[in-house]
Amino acid sequence: FERTRSLQDPCSNCPAGTFCDNNRNQICSPCPPNSFSSAGGQRTCDICRQCKGVFRTRKECSSTSNAECDCTPGFHCLGAGCSMCEQDCKQGQELTKKGCKDCCFGTFNDQKRGICRPWTNCSLDGKSVLVNGTKERDVVCGPSPADLSPGASSVTPPAPAREPGHSPQ
């Protein structure tokens, strides 16, 4: 790397992946191993994030970009940039302070995360229950009883279930 020659700040010419080394007369030096600078003109390189414990490396650190972590099997990411990992549960369960618990009757969870949610109330839309709900699945609403008179043909599609509840990420 050559010494920069900017009249204003000699460090401004140091590209990403380098730092302006005051100990070497403001020469642009490459970031040391396990560190990075994502923008130019940096006077230091930042230490890379370390994916340890429950975290595993999703993307290795490079001289210009930080490492990215995700969670080991059995856990899913929470927080900005996956700063925490939360235990997975089975479908039909929700996570409580005492661990994974089955959904109560009348509720379901079709994911490994989030909370159990009430079955859709078909009667609110004037429909009837076509398929009963389970711990893992919402009910399927069918045509209203009036629509089941002789001659009625097509089955109306089920009312869309509410958005699944996601843990913050």
Epitope: T44, D46, I47, C48, R49, Q50, K52, G53, V54, F55, R56, C71, T72, P73, G74, F75, L78, G79, A80, G81, S83, M84, C85, E86, Q87, L95, K97, G99
Partner: antibody, heavy 124, light 106 residues
Framework: EVQLVESGGGLVQPGGSLRLSCAAS??????????VAWIRQAPGKGLEWVSS????????YYADSVKGRFTISRDNSKNTLYLQLNSLRAEDTAVYYC???????????????WGQGTLVTVSS | DIQLTQSPSSLSASVGDRVTITCQAS??????LAWYQQKPGKAPKLLIY???NRATGIPSRFSGSGSGTDFTLTISSLQPEDFATYYC????????FGQGTKVEIK
Amino acid sequence: EVQLVESGGGLVQPGGSLRLSCAASGFSLSTGGVGVAWIRQAPGKGLEWVSSISGYGSTTYYADSVKGRFTISRDNSKNTLYLQLNSLRAEDTAVYYCAREGSDAVLGDWFGYWGQGTLVTVSS
Amino acid sequence: DIQLTQSPSSLSASVGDRVTITCQASQDITTYLAWYQQKPGKAPKLLIYDASNRATGIPSRFSGSGSGTDFTLTISSLQPEDFATYYCQQGYYLWTFGQGTKVEIK
């Protein structure tokens, strides 16, 4: 309920060795992702992280001050964590705590569970 | 390595006071910061994790904020049982603790 109980501390001469144990209950040390650590506190001083071992892949980590002298390990069958202390120095005198990462069902790089500590005194 | 600098190193306060302790990291650590309380002869106790999440059973008077390099622990109304030493800790790269802040009775 998560519990950590340390033992093995005592008086040892400079240059000597000691093995600390931490018996874990309420969780499995071999569970993927559950990291455990040793953290020490010299008399009247602050907390200093010493060493960690991850539950996933058994990767080990050491503070520069103990690297090459201390060894962290675990016995999954006994659900016990160990710290082997060799070439001990006066500055290693401290209460040594065993701690588990995370809290409840959320894991991360913090310590939600701590043992009561065991005192190591290095003196001639 | 990443250094954490706590300030003040000690403070005197009265019951009912609002107390603020700061922790500055030597580089950006996003939200990889926790706060602990330690009383003499006892093990540290987790108060806050991921910069702002209160640990289970911790009273709401304790709150954490900040991201990047500057973090704050606030006790909104100091109680008699809150006189202790408080530590910040980062887990972004390895693990390091701040030097501690002792909260004493005025």
